[in-house]
Structures are given as C-alpha cells and as structure tokens.
C-alpha cells in the first residue's frame, strides 16, 4: 500500500510540477503535509532557476548533478538521495517525511553513521576484551600484544613466548632466564653478560675504584687490601682501610740517663775515647739491666789494638775475657744478674788483678801480671766501645760469644772520668734511650721483622717435616702476623696471624696458606696484661692446635688440598719471619700488618733467641718488653 | 684485513621494499663471538640501530622497526641482508652494516638510500 | 630503552688542549663505545668495552666510566681530532647511540 501512495503521489508530481509549474498550494496538494512541502518548494524553486529555458550557460554548468528538470525535481522528496549518510559507516538509508534514517554498521555511531565508536573505551567491555592492547580502527577493533607475547586463537588474549625454549642459544654461554615478555641472561657473581660476544666476563671491580688502598682482582671477585707495613687494615666494610688501633697500651716511657745497649742489631752503641795520663788504669762502672742472657756490656782496647778487656754476659753471669802481651784469660763469675733488676757492676783494674764487683760485692779477682794496657809517650790511650766490638775482634777472642745484647746501664763512670759528654750525645738520640719499666720477653713494635734459617725437614719421622710451634702473646694491637714461613718466589705457605674479631674487643686467630686462610679460631680475648699461650702442630697431612680455650685436630674439605700446596713449599726452602712480613706483595697473605706486643716463639722445642736471628729490625728487643701501661689517678 | 660493503638500490618509492646487501671479507660470520649490524643515519643526523645478527643466527631488531625489518645472512657467501618493507620518506638515510667480534669492530663505507615518489 | 645524553652538544679546543666530552645513560651500562665520524665518512671506533683502545687509535684518546656516567677525553687536541664523537651502549637491545658532540678547532 505504501509503495502504491509513492507511486501516486510521483504521478500527481511528474503532472503538477514538471509537466507545468506549479505553486506552493499546488504542491501542498501533492504532498497532503506541510514539513514535506516546506521541505520541497524551496528546492524546486532552485530545480526551476537551474533549468528554465532562457537560464545562462553558466547556470547550468552549477554544480547541480542531475541533468535535466525532470531528475532535478524527482530528487527532492527521496531524503537518501543524494546520500546523507557516511558511507564507511552506513548500512542502509531510509527515506521518511522529509527527512532520513541511516542505518549504522556495527562499530559506528551517529545520525548519519559519521562516528566510530572506540570499543577500546566501552565501559562495559574494558579494553575491549584485549588482555593487552586494544588497537581501535574505523568501525571495528582489533587486539594485539606486547612484544615478547604471542594471540591465542581466541584473539584477545595473550601469551609469554620462552625466548629461553624457543631458541637455547639466545644467551650464549650464559644462562638464560625467562621473564614476562621478554628473558634475561644471567652471570654468576663477580660477572657480567657481554651481548656483543653472548658471554660471561669477568667484572673488573678494580677499575672501578672499589678499594681504598690495594685491589687484587681475580675471576669472578676481586680482593681489597690494606698497607698493613703503614699501620692499615681492611675495615669491616672489606673495602675500606683503617688504622689498626692498639688495644693494649704499652708503657713506652724512656729516660735518656738510661743507655740503650740493643740500639743496633749489628753493631756499637756508643764509642769512646781516652786519653789519660799513664799512672791511670781501666776502670768501669754502671747499673746494668737485662733479661739477655748473652751478650757484649763493653769492650776496651789499646790504641794499637793489642791489649783488649770484654766485660759481657754469658748464661747471665759475668764474664771477663783479657788479652794483652802477658797473658790472655777467659773467667766467669758471679751470681746471674739477667734478672731483670738494677745490677751495680764494676770492674777495676788494680796493680796485680782486676776485680769484679756485682752490688759492691767482690764476685771475680783475676791476676794480671803488668799494666792492662801499655801507656806511650806518657799517655794511656784507650777506646771504649759499648754493646759490641769492632768486627775484626770477634777471630781473636778466646770464647767466641754472640755480642747482641737487650740490656741498659745508667749511672756509668769510666776512667773515673764520671758521665761527662756522655750524656749530651744520648740526650739528643731517642733511640738510644732505654724505656723506664722493661718486663721479659720480646717486643715488637710493629715496625719490623727478624728473620731465622730453621731446617723443618731435619726428621725422621714419615712425614718428612714438621712445624710445631708455642707461642706465648701478648699483643698490644689486635692485628699483625705473628709468624710467617716465606718462599723463594715470595708466596707464604704458611702464616699465623692476629686479626681484630668482629665481636669487640676480642681477636681471632688466623692460620693461612698463602692467601687462604685455613682456619679461623674466632673471638679470644688476647689484648689483656696477661700472656696467652698457643700452639700449633702441622706436617703435611695434619693441622693441630691448641689456644686457651680448646684443642682440636682440624680437617674440612679444602685443608688437604692447602696442606699439598704448604708441603710443595716446605720441600724447598723456606724462611721463617717474626713479627711480620718481608717485601712480598699485600695480596700473599690475608694479613700484612706487622705485629705489634710481646711474643716469645718456640720452634721445635728451640726457644728462638732474637740475637741469634738472621737478620731483626732493630725496634724489635730481643729480650725486654714494655709493661703495660697503667692508668694512674693523675692521669 | 677486515672489509665491509654495503650495497642497495640507490632510491626507491614509497611503499616498496629496500633490500641492503652487506658483503664483508677478512672474517668468518660462523665464527664464535662475531655479529653484524645494521645501523642507518639520516643526513645531517645521528646513528640509529636497526638489526644484529650473531654467528649462531640469532637475530635482534629494534623494536620500533621490528615489524618491518627482515635480517638473515649467507654464511657461504659472506654475506648479510637487510629487508625494510613499505619504506617512507622518513627511510631516506645512509646505511651502514658493521662487524662486532672478537677482533675489533669495523663499519663499511655506507650506502645511501632516498626515497621519493 | 636506554637513552644516551651526550655533553656538550658542540665544543671547540685549541691544539694542545685536554678535551672531555661526557655519556650519560638514562640506566646503568656495562659497556660503552665510542665512534669519531667526520663528514662524508663513516664512523671509526675508537673505545670499545668502556676504556679499551681501539686498533690504530691513537693513545692521547682514552674512556672511562661506570654506571650511567662515561667520558671520552682527548689528552691533547689536535687538529685532526676535529670530528663528531659519539658514545653507544652495548648493554641492552635495543642498541643506542648518544646524540653526538661535535668537536671543532679552535
């Protein structure tokens, strides 16, 4: 029926309006309404002045589409033509009462379909649905994903694609890590992973300024080392160093009326010179103190050497060795005086003997037949040396005796010529300043080392060598090696050294091959004014060792591996150092700081006398240490 | 001793394929620890990478480009091959390859691509 | 991605003079590369692996740097050293290049 009224209603149009000109009135007729009327009239009036005939060229040459009258004005009445709607986004187009509908696609919005809707945006559909991205398109959407993730079929969600299963070598000789969308490739620690080669290298901490003093790097970690010869060790920060503190303080005090006789490892203390008239003869005498067992007090001669007087201890008693052109005599006498205390010696040469005094007392009377020393030209000329004698005189004596000795002597007089111009040359060298208060032992003030030559393979035993070594410490800072033994090639086989421990004011004990410390005794409190005693036993399948606290036999997994590197060296030559290392490099051992406090050492059941050593810093006393310093009311 | 040469079609239209040959000599791309590169600079600007191919095949690409970027290689030629689809003017640049290994990195001379309707 | 900020974006030296230009990663790097391009030339390397000299380089070049903060300095300049310079990094995909310092002589 619709259809029939629009064929109608074309008819009474094509008769009305195009076959004659027709006015408002005549066109409400056709159209039976007035929006369609009012909607038609003004175009048709355009139609008209578009093609009447008499209209300018150029009229007809608008921009008008339709060829003729007749299409002009049956365009009118169809809303949809020409098409109002979007074309992307219409499906259809319904002609209605002068007006259209446009019939959207889905995907698009709008009176005329102009308008994509963004599914992406859709409140009730988050993100369209995408588990990932939403791409919004015109009239439609679609979802994709992150790199690293691959469309499932149901094309919106998304899954991680394992780079690491997908292709094995993607890393390399790393190790390949899958993370979401995307994968890692992991280095052990200390390394870092080189794309450009797909490997593992070494970091280089040392290049990056990790440590403040010495850094040693190795694969896959590096080291940091402190200048312990300068008083440094590692902070606990394993980077940092810090000065190693003194945990006990010493009693340092020295008086300069008090002679240093061990100034010198090798070597006169002090040398004078006589010059007297010949009616005088030799005389000395002094305080003496010491712990020394052995060693040279003083040593007089002639000016032309041929007549000689040793005043020394041997044993810790006085001894007197005389040579000149009557006689030549060795006597020792005496109670011992290494005690320790003040001891007043003299020794005077008298007409027909010279007479030996300890405390006043008569202890040694030796005949001499004629003068000690030979005056010439009316003068007696005689040199006195302290604590040695020239190096020439050790062939001639009649007993040989090892020179050094730890002692000091004050109130000395000799020639009867008092101290005169003595003690101004003392006062002004610090060195030669003996300390005030001296306990036994040996010291070491963490300046220096002694070094021993000790045969470890002279036994019979199978295993060939041995170490066993007693040490009685006490330290005055709580970091230093204690003993060290060193290889021609500058390694350490084998150390034992002090280290502060973690927990305060207590130390720990370590023992190492080379840089590896094999075994840690931890938290002792060592820095106290009493000794503490130690021992160590090892050969080349064993580790023994005993502290205050515990003995125990040690093995773990690495001790065997360490105790083949110790018995490789020890098959060579090694040299044993107290106190300290030699000049080898701050990453051979895990400790490098001198040693600094009292330490008496036994190696193989000998007691190591500091005079016998090879060669001692000169600091190190071989036979006094200082007492603890004691903290007065004033103070 | 080391060389690399790039070589491609001078100029091409927009939407079109670009493909860079890059024929090297003096070492081996089988070799462990070597890889290629593909790098491009725009006149008067600066460097941007594009793709790496690695001895073992392994390909990477930049991922603002990965779409379009093809990398492969013919170790038994000595050669390595870049693809760019549907290029732009914004493609117009010199393209360079570049060697990565474990004896120095070397560049090639560069090619020059414009692209212009 | 990491991005590469080069400093300064131009600087000019007098023969002689020690010049320092400075890499600044938007990340922390492990391995940073430095190129010398003059005009019409291709890029030469000059640094590879942060502080390694390239073959044929010359020593007064030398790198340094970790983390996100890397130079390249010239402990004197010469005039052939007038070039653009730019750092790379080869810790990550995708692979960047600094924006580039151009050197010229005073």
């Known amino acids: 029926a619709n259809s029939l009224l629009e064929e109608t209603k074309q008819g009474n149009l094509e008769r009305e309006c195009i076959e004659e000109l027709c006015n408002k009135e005549e066109a409400r007729e056709v159209f039976e309404n007035d929006p369609e009327t009012d909607y038609f009239y003004p175009k048709y009036l355009v139609c008209l002045r578009s093609f009447q005939t008499g209209l300018f060229t150029a009229a007809r040459q608008s921009t008008n589409a339709y060829p003729d009258l007749r299409s002009c004005v049956n365009a009118i009445p169809d809303q949809c033509s020409p098409l109002p709607c979007n074309e992307d986004g219409y499906m259809s187009c319904k002609d209605g009462k002068a007006s259209f509908t446009c019939t959207c696609k889905p995907g698009w919005q709008g009176e005329k379909c102009e308008f994509d809707i963004n599914e992406c945006k859709d409140p009730s559909n988050i993100n369209g649905g995408c588990s990932q991205i939403c791409d919004n398109t015109p009239g439609s959407y679609h979802c994709s994903c992150k790199n690293g993730f691959v469309m499932l079929s149901n094309k919106k969600d998304c899954k991680d694609v394992d780079e690491c299963s997908l292709k094995p070598s993607i890393c390399g000789t790393a190790v390949c890590k899958n993370i979401p969308g995307d994968f890692e490739c992991e280095c052990p620690e200390g390394y870092r992973y080189n794309l450009k080669s797909k490997s593992c290298e070494d970091i280089d901490e040392c290049s990056e300024n990790m440590c403040a003093q010495l850094c040693v790097n190795y694969p896959g970690g590096y080291t940091c080392y402190c200048d312990g010869k300068k008083g440094f060790k590692l902070a606990q920060d394993q980077k940092s160093c810090e000065v190693v503190s003194v945990c006990l303080p010493l009693n340092l005090d020295t008086k300069y009326e008090l002679l240093y006789l061990a100034e010198q490892f090798a070597g006169v203390v002090l040398y004078l010179k006589f010059r007297l008239p010949e009616i005088s003869r030799f005389s000395a005498e002094f305080d003496f103190r010491t712990y020394d067992s052995e060693g040279v007090i003083l040593y007089a001669e002639s000016i032309d050497h041929s007549a000689w007087l040793l005043i020394a201890l041997r044993g810790g008693k006085i001894e007197v060795q005389l040579k000149n052109e009557h006689t030549s005599k060795i006597t020792t006498g005496g109670d011992v005086i290494n005690n320790g205390l003040w001891n007043m010696v003299s020794v005077e040469e008298l007409e027909h003997s010279i007479s030996i005094k300890i405390a006043k007392e008569a202890v040694m009377d030796i005949n001499k037949p004629g003068p000690l020393f030979k005056p010439e030209n009316g003068l007696l000329e005689t040199k006195v040396y302290f604590a040695g004698f020239p190096r020439k005189v050790e062939s001639e004596l009649i007993k040989p005796i090892n020179p050094r000795l730890d002692g000091c002597i004050r109130s000395w007089n000799l020639m009867k010529q008092g101290a005169s111009g003595i003690k101004e040359i003392i006062q002004e060298k610090q060195n030669k300043h003996c300390l005030v208060t001296v306990e036994k032992g040996s010291y070491y003030p963490g300046s220096g080392i002694a070094q021993f030559h000790i045969d470890y393979n002279n036994v019979s035993s199978a295993e060939g060598w041995h170490v066993n070594v007693t040490l009685n410490i006490r330290p005055s800072t709580g970091t230093g090696v204690m003993l060290a033994l060193v290889s021609g090639n500058n390694t350490v086989p084998f150390a034992v050294s002090l280290v502060d421990s973690t927990s305060e004011k207590s130390q720990d004990i370590l023992l190492s091959v080379e840089n590896t410390v094999i075994y840690r005794i931890q938290a002792l409190s060592l820095c106290s004014d009493q000794q503490s005693h130690l021992e160590f036993r090892v050969n080349r399948n064993n580790l023994e060792l005993s502290t205050p606290l515990k003995i125990e036999t040690i093995s773990h997994e690495d001790l065997q591996r360490q105790l083949a590197v110790l018995d490789k060296a020890m098959k060579a030559k090694v040299a044993t150092y107290l106190g300290g290392l030699p000049d080898v490099p701050f990453s051979a051992t895990p400790v490098n700081a001198f040693y600094n406090g009292c330490m008496e050492v036994n190696i193989n059941g000998v007691q190591l006398d500091l005079d016998e050593a090879i060669s001692k810093h000169n600091d190190i006393r071989a036979h006094s240490c200082p007492s603890v310093w004691k903290k007065t009311k004033n103070s | 001793q080391v060389t690399l040469k790039e070589s491609g079609p001078g100029i091409l239209q927009p939407s079109q394929t670009l493909s860079l040959t890059c024929s090297f000599s003096?070492?081996?791309?089988?070799?462990?620890?070597?890889?290629v590169s593909w790098i491009r600079q725009p006149s008067g600007k600066g460097l941007e990478w594009l793709a790496h191919?690695?001895?073992?095949?392994?390909?990477r690409y930049n991922p603002s480009l990965k779409s379009r970027l093809t990398i492969s290689r013919d170790t038994s030629s000595n050669q390595v091959f870049l693809k760019i689809t549907s290029v732009d003017t914004a493609d117009t640049a010199t393209y360079y390859c570049?060697?990565?290994?474990?004896?120095?990195?070397?560049w090639g001379q560069g090619t020059t691509l414009t692209v212009s309707s | 991605q990491i991005v590469l900020t080069q400093s300064p974006a131009i600087m000019s030296a007098s023969p002689g003079e020690k010049v320092t230009m400075t890499c600044s990663a938007s990340?922390?790097?492990?391995?940073m590369y430095w190129y010398q391009q003059k005009p019409g030339s291709s890029p030469r390397i000059l640094i590879y692996?942060?502080?390694n000299l390239a073959s044929g380089v010359p020593v007064r070049f030398s790198g340094s740097g970790s983390g996100t903060s890397y130079s390249l300095t010239i402990s004197r300049m010469e005039a052939e050293d007038a070039a653009t310079y730019y750092c790379?990094?080869?810790?990550?995909?995708?692979?960047?290049f600094g924006a580039g310092t151009k050197l010229e002589l005073k």
């Open positions: 191919i690695y001895w073992d095949d392994d390909k």
């Open positions: 790379q990094q080869w810790s990550s995909y995708p692979l960047t």
């Open positions: 570049a060697l990565y290994g474990n004896y120095g990195d070397y």
């Open positions: 990340s922390s790097v492990s391995y």
């Open positions: 692996d942060t502080s």
């Open positions: 003096g070492f081996s791309l089988s070799t462990s620890g070597m890889g």
